[in-house]
């Protein structure tokens, strides 16, 4: 019986460990500044790091600029987006800027895209100041199904701060779907 | 066998409970306004409450102004920093302010400090308005090792809002490292 | 013994699953724009969706404009509040706005209300620009007891963005209280 109990304990430990790790996908993706699109209109950001510096991914997939869910569950999603401009970078086309982020979910089965979270601000970035900066943070709790894709859209991508501590997004699984 | 099963169940319940609690360190630290440094340049904030009001800590340590990790894991880190100024507090030296927060990680083994997250905004706080306010929120998911330290740096610390609901930072463990 | 082991495994699987699901209440509530109060002073927002679009709730209750905790625990709470104004909506009474959110906790046993988190900004929304936008995000980790209620207060409710991706708040349980 003692051996049997050890076996029960052992198998349970495996199962508990395995299910715990399997149950908790995550990703933290940081901006890849070598490939930021230009322009001031809303664009999808497709270049992110997933395996250098603070960037990491587990039990999720990064492909074609999108974070792909591999496991059904409820996830906490977040994004931090920083915009900046220094006068040495040249003159802005307009002082009135709309600095925005949109976190979107795309379902391949039903090819449609929906915005889960948005944030940002209109800003007046006057030439009287040599430096301007603004950050947006959004976060929320969402049900995600395997195969669904998360992507980030921003306005004024050419103003993005390329630092890994500045412009990033991520997700981590909190619980299963009942 | 029934007794044996009860023993298995009991030991498992203990193990499950124990491992669950041990696996989830957390902290929510609120600003200690009795000791806010002056100046407008970037400074490290070292005075935080950990055991009064909303402030609390478990399986982590607060020492020398830093939040110390006691247990390896993936943690969600967050900070909320509020700045404010009322004309009755005195006249500002400049209308052009850079109100920023930096969440940094320090490793004692390799004595180096790295910024995990940053946020903030340049603001124009004119004397034409009697009150000014601005809040920053940042959050992200990071791998932390036992012994690593988290600290908060801000610009313009004398403008910090001293309320516990305004200026705080925290962390909670989400999962083990595989 | 094999049958006994299966029984142990089975009962454990049930217990593990049940305790896991019971232990993780959550809510993500989105603004119900059909019933937003007017005015510019601080008001409590009582109309939220809990079961349409991104809105959802489990093991928590939404009643009388408040999110009610059904299970003791440590929760991560968050809110995202967007304000916007287009010149076609009419003229603002003042260009100097205080756009704020307060996440409050009310205990019925001790009838008192306390602010857990606040965020926002003073803004100058001039008539020189046709569109203005601003978003606030706050988040933090709090101990909540069964029966306690979470509510949202904002200034200038008539400027709220009514989209489900813009104005929402939520909570999810991270761990039990020791």
């Amino acid at each position: 019986i003692r051996a049997e109990k050890a076996m029960v304990d052992g198998s349970w430990l495996d199962l508990a460990k395995r299910s715990k790790l399997e149950a908790q996908p995550f990703a933290h993706l940081t901006i890849n500044a070598t490939d930021i699109p230009s322009g001031s209109h809303k664009v999808s950001l497709s270049s992110w790091y997933h395996d250098r510096g603070w960037a990491k991914i587990s039990n999720m997939t990064f492909s074609n600029g999108k974070l792909i869910v591999n496991q059904d569950g409820f996830y906490y999603l977040y994004a931090n987006i920083c915009f900046r401009h220094h006068e040495t970078s040249g003159d802005l086309a307009t002082e009135y800027l709309q600095l925005m982020v949109y976190v979107t979910k795309t379902s391949i089965k039903i090819p449609s895209s929906h915005t889960l979270m948005k944030g940002g601000s209109t800003k007046y970035w006057s030439g009287n100041s040599e430096f301007h900066f603004y950050s947006i943070n959004v976060g929320g709790f969402f049900k995600l199904r395997s195969g669904e894709e998360i992507s980030i859209e921003v306005s004024n991508p050419s103003l993005l701060d390329p630092d890994q501590d500045a412009t990033y997004f991520g997700a981590f699984k909190v619980r299963d779907i009942d | 066998i029934r007794a044996e099963k009860a023993m298995v169940d009991g030991s498992w319940l203990d193990l499950a409970k124990r491992s669950k609690l041990e696996a989830q360190p957390f902290a929510h630290l609120t600003i200690n306004a009795t000791d806010i440094p002056s100046g407008s340049h970037k400074v490290s904030l070292s005075s935080w409450y950990h055991d009064r009001g909303w402030a609390k800590i478990s399986n982590m340590t607060f020492s020398n102004g830093k939040l110390i990790v006691n247990q390896d894991g993936f943690y969600y880190l967050y900070a909320n920093i509020c700045f404010r100024h009322h004309e009755t507090s005195g006249d500002l030296a400049t209308e052009y302010l850079q109100l920023m927060v930096y969440v940094t990680k320090t490793s004692i083994k390799i004595p180096s400090s790295h910024t995990l997250m940053k946020g903030g905004s340049t603001k124009y706080w004119s004397g034409n308005s009697e009150f000014h306010f601005y809040s920053i929120n940042v959050g992200g998911f990071f791998k932390l090792r036992s012994g690593e330290e988290i600290s908060i740096e801000v610009s313009n610390p004398s403008l910090l809002d001293p309320d516990q609901d305004a200026t705080y930072f925290g962390a909670f463990k989400v999962r083990d490292i595989d | 013994i094999r049958a006994e082991k299966a029984m142990v495994d089975g009962s454990w699987l049930d217990l593990a699953k049940r305790s896991k699901l019971e232990a993780q209440p959550f809510a993500h509530l989105t603004i119900n724009a059909t019933d937003i109060p007017s005015g510019s002073h601080k008001v409590s927002l009582s109309s939220w969706y809990h079961d349409r679009g991104w809105a959802k709730i489990s093991n928590m209750t939404f009643s009388n404009g408040k999110l009610i905790v059904n299970q003791d625990g440590f929760y991560y709470l968050y809110a995202n509040i967007c304000f916007r104004h287009h010149e076609t909506s009419g003229d603002l009474a003042t260009e100097y706005l205080q756009l704020m959110v307060y996440v409050t906790k009310t205990s019925i046993k001790i009838p008192s209300s306390h602010t857990l988190m606040k965020g926002g900004s003073t803004k100058y929304w001039s008539g020189n620009s046709e569109f203005h936008f601003y978003s606030i995000n706050v988040g933090g980790f709090f101990k909540l007891r069964s029966g306690e209620e979470i509510s949202i207060e904002v200034s200038n409710p008539s400027l709220l963005d009514p989209d489900q991706d813009a104005t929402y708040f939520g909570a999810f349980k991270v761990r039990d209280i020791d």
Epitope: N128 | G39, S40, L92, A93, E95, Y96, Y124, S126, S158 | -
Partner: nanobody
């Protein structure tokens, strides 16, 4: 290097007015980056703070004895600061110095040691 040059001093009767100017020059000087202030030193006394103005000109601070009589202002396009002095009194007699500094605190600096650059001063004499 930043150079500050005061002008506009002179002899005036009690109750009269004067307008002091402080012109800033220097290869790297940009007025909008500097807090500016006026100090004065009466014969046999320590140099004292009179008034200061924020980089953009919307925040001003004064010593109590000159409030409602003196007005500090600036024109960043001309790299110049002014001190309009009215209802002058004999006790306002002093050498008036212009000072400038990049902000190192959130609030207007009021002590001498907080200022980096100084002018040579201009004499103001108020006769009774």
């Amino acid at each position: 290097e930043v150079q500050l040059v005061e002008s506009g001093g002179g002899l005036v009767q009690s109750g009269g007015s004067l307008r002091l100017s402080c012109a800033a020059a220097g290869y790297t000087f940009r007025a909008r980056a500097y807090v500016m202030g006026w100090f004065r030193q009466a014969p046999g006394k320590e140099r004292e703070f009179v008034a200061a103005i924020s980089t953009g000109g919307t925040w001003t601070g004064y010593v109590d004895s000159v409030k409602d009589r003196f007005t500090i202002s600036r024109d960043n396009t001309k790299n110049t600061m002014y001190l309009q002095m009215a209802s002058l009194k004999p006790e306002d007699t002093a050498v008036y110095y212009c000072a400038a500094t990049t902000p190192s605190t959130s609030y207007l600096p009021r002590s001498e040691r907080q200022y980096e650059y100084w002018g040579q001063g201009t004499q103001v004499t108020v006769s009774s």
